[in-house]
């Protein structure tokens, strides 16, 4: 579900949403840490309907969801985290 990308590209997100997205509509979540060309952390949600949404990292819902995923991964098997460069 979670993917962390380290990239040298500039910021990906022009517009960010804070609206809750139910998990059944989510395919995967990309986390782009700040640095390497972008001064802020970016969260990109890839939805099952093939659309993509940039989520405000400060949005309460995404922070709550990340916490749930962290707790789940620490109490069971780790959630796969993919670290790779985007060409």
């Amino acid at each position: 579900v979670l993917e962390v990308y380290y990239t040298s590209l500039r910021c990906r997100c022009v517009q960010e949403s804070s609206v809750f997205i139910p998990r059944r509509f989510i395919d995967r979540i990309q986390i782009l840490p700040r640095g390497n060309g972008c001064p802020r952390k970016e969260i990109i949600v890839w939805k099952k309907n093939k659309s993509i949404v940039c989520v405000d990292p400060q949005a309460e819902w995404i922070q709550r969801m990340m916490e749930v995923l962290r707790k789940r991964s620490s109490s069971t098997l780790p959630v796969p985290v993919f670290k790779r460069k985007i060409p």
């Epitope: 804070s18 609206v19 809750f20 997205i21 139910p22 998990r23 059944r24 509509f25 939805k47 099952k48 309907n49 659309s51 309460e60 819902w61 709550r64 969801m65 749930v68």
Partner: antibody, heavy 120, light 107 residues
Framework: EVQLVQSGGGLVQPGGSLRLSCAAS????????MSWVRQAPGKGLEWVGE????????NYAPSLKDRFTISRDNAKNSLYLQMNSVRAEDTAVYYC?????????????WGQGTTVTVSS | DIQMTQSPSSLSASVGDRVTITCKAS??????VAWYQQKPGKAPKLLIY???YRYTGVPSRFSGSGSGTDFTFTISSVQPEDIATYYC?????????FGGGTKLEIK
């Protein structure tokens, strides 16, 4: 203008079957999840179930999944609810609704409702 | 299933009053809560989504707040046209569930 026009309601005997329809216009029907919600006389809203755009995922209220079947025909812009082995407690107004998964993620457009009466 | 407990079941207010409805989820639903307005003989209408966001065209007197298990819906200044029944709904996970409704009457 988005419209969800419902049909197929009526009087049905206990144990009988009925198929409700919901015809959509003004939206790209094939892109959206759709839901059915019902409301018994003088009661609150009860979710019946939902179907995704390509019909590969259908979720039901646990108490109804053995008797009710949700389907859709994207070529006809139509949503269906097949009700089998109906009981008196299935008497209700049935609503179809668009379950938006692009911006709001809630039920943003509703049909006018169709009344189902189960009685002998 | 996630239960949504809504209160009060009915309330009476004067025009201009501020009214508040609460909804409590039986487990964490993040901010996956919507509020609907239903007038007699009509289909429900979406007012609030994601706990606190007003749907297109909804007057600013309607607002929502909350996260986790506790949610609030407020009408800051009740108008005669607000006579209706209001429902909360969780759409965090299936089966989707509604609160029992709050019937608003005008004194």
């Amino acid at each position: 203008e988005v419209q969800l026009v419902q049909s197929g309601g009526g009087l049905v005997q206990p144990g009988g079957s009925l198929r409700l329809s919901c015809a959509a216009s003004g939206i790209d029907f094939s892109r959206y999840w759709m839901s059915w919600v019902r409301q018994a006389p003088g009661k609150g809203l009860e979710w019946v179930g939902e179907i995704n755009p390509d019909s590969s995922t259908i979720n039901y209220a646990p108490s109804l999944k053995d008797r009710f079947t949700i389907s859709r025909d994207n070529a006809k812009n139509s949503l269906y609810l097949q009700m089998n082995s109906v009981r008196a407690e299935d008497t209700a107004v049935y609503y179809c609704a668009r379950q938006d998964d692009y911006e709001y993620y809630a039920m943003d457009y509703w049909g006018q409702g169709t009344t189902v009466t189960v009685s002998s | 299933d996630i239960q949504m407990t809504q209160s009060p079941s009915s309330l009476s207010a004067s025009v201009g009053d501020r009214v508040t409805i609460t909804c409590k989820a039986s487990q964490d639903v993040n901010t996956g809560v919507a509020w609907y307005q239903q007038k007699p003989g009509k289909a429900p209408k979406l007012l609030i989504y994601s706990a606190s966001y007003r749907y297109t065209g909804v007057p600013s007197r309607f607002s929502g707040s909350g996260s986790g298990t506790d949610f609030t819906f407020t009408i800051s200044s009740v108008q005669p046209e607000d006579i209706a029944t209001y429902y909360c709904q969780q759409y965090y996970s299936t089966p989707l569930t509604f609160g029992g409704g709050t019937k608003l009457e005008i004194k």
